[in-house]
């Protein structure tokens, strides 16, 4: 069974998938469609890297631009380095500026909804 066939079989169960499962899926050439991606749990999507999202979505990554103001894409963008977002070639804006340090302060983030940044 190839990645696409596997994805069709598990698609209906993906809404509640944890980050670990999404990371594993990104290695299997599944080409998840945008509609499915938009239904994923925000907390599961946030830890994914740009490279992992690109692999997870395949050609569907082109659809991120039209969804950049909607969750979970909007919140995911805020967590990525702008340099990494630029590699997607879609003009996605709102990432962490180059030269900033991201502190993983879970309590701060839980309260504010955004990561804590230290300037250069």
């Amino acid at each position: 069974m190839n990645g696409s066939e596997y994805f069709v079989k598990i698609q209906s169960f993906l809404g509640g998938a944890p980050t670990e499962d999404l990371k594993a899926l990104s290695q299997q050439n599944v080409s998840m469609d945008l509609a499915t991606f938009m239904k994923l749990r925000t907390d599961a999507v946030l830890p994914l890297t740009v490279a992992e999202v690109q692999k997870l979505l395949g050609p569907h990554v082109e659809g991120l631009k039209a969804e950049e103001r909607h969750r979970p894409v909007r919140d995911w963008i805020l967590r990525q380095r702008q340099d990494d977002l630029d590699t997607l070639g879609l003009g996605l804006q709102g990432g962490i500026p180059n030269g900033y340090l991201v502190l993983d302060l879970s309590m701060q983030e839980a309260l504010s909804g955004t990561p804590c940044l230290l300037g250069p």
Epitope: D33, L34, P59, H60, E62, G63, A66, D86, G89, G91
Partner: antibody
Framework: EVQLVQSGAEVKKPGASVKVSCKAS????????MHWVRQAPGQGLEWMGN????????YYNERFRSRVTMTVDKSTSTVYMELSSLRSEDTAVYYC??????????????WGQGTTVTVSS | DIQMTQSPSSLSASVGDRVTITCKAS??????IAWYQHKPGKAPKLLIH???ELQPGVPSRFSGSGSGRDYTFTISSLQPEDIATYYC?????????FGGGTKVEIK
Amino acid sequence: EVQLVQSGAEVKKPGASVKVSCKASGYTFTNYWMHWVRQAPGQGLEWMGNINPSNGGPYYNERFRSRVTMTVDKSTSTVYMELSSLRSEDTAVYYCARPYYGSSYGYFDYWGQGTTVTVSS
Amino acid sequence: DIQMTQSPSSLSASVGDRVTITCKASQDINKYIAWYQHKPGKAPKLLIHYTSELQPGVPSRFSGSGSGRDYTFTISSLQPEDIATYYCLQYANPLRTFGGGTKVEIK
């Protein structure tokens, strides 16, 4: 003003390869993927694939996957489409097209002027 | 991939006539359809996107409608300059597909 300027007409022999260029200007080149569409005589428009201008990653129509190569030169804001093992059925006008990402995956709002490729022995 | 079945493949109508072209998608495309006018030796020209949104500068005689799998493109009053081939494009999927085209001629 957005402009997509393509290379000139080509005449090739069967079995040869052709490389068509598309130079973009008037917008941030790395903010939009570039697509290639062709039209053979008496046929409709056919989507061939696209390329991410930032990292050079392409996605191809399955029909052309074994014969097409799309590349990018960021320094000159130019994308290239190379088609190999040419046959007479590849005689067509080849267009580059830029999408507008207003909704979903984007429709094409800007097109190159087209490059005529003739395959003949 | 999503297939787009366009009909008719050609039509002949008189100036002033109402012309209708249809495109049927192989699956629901959520209104993500665009319509193009293509004249010989020219690049395709975008007329309509998202089923019914008219591009700036495009005459109001052109219109579009539909939902789900079925879509319609209409020229309310055919003009001599409308002689061209018209194509639908689905962009609900990143692997874009066009309809087969409709060649419009004047009687």
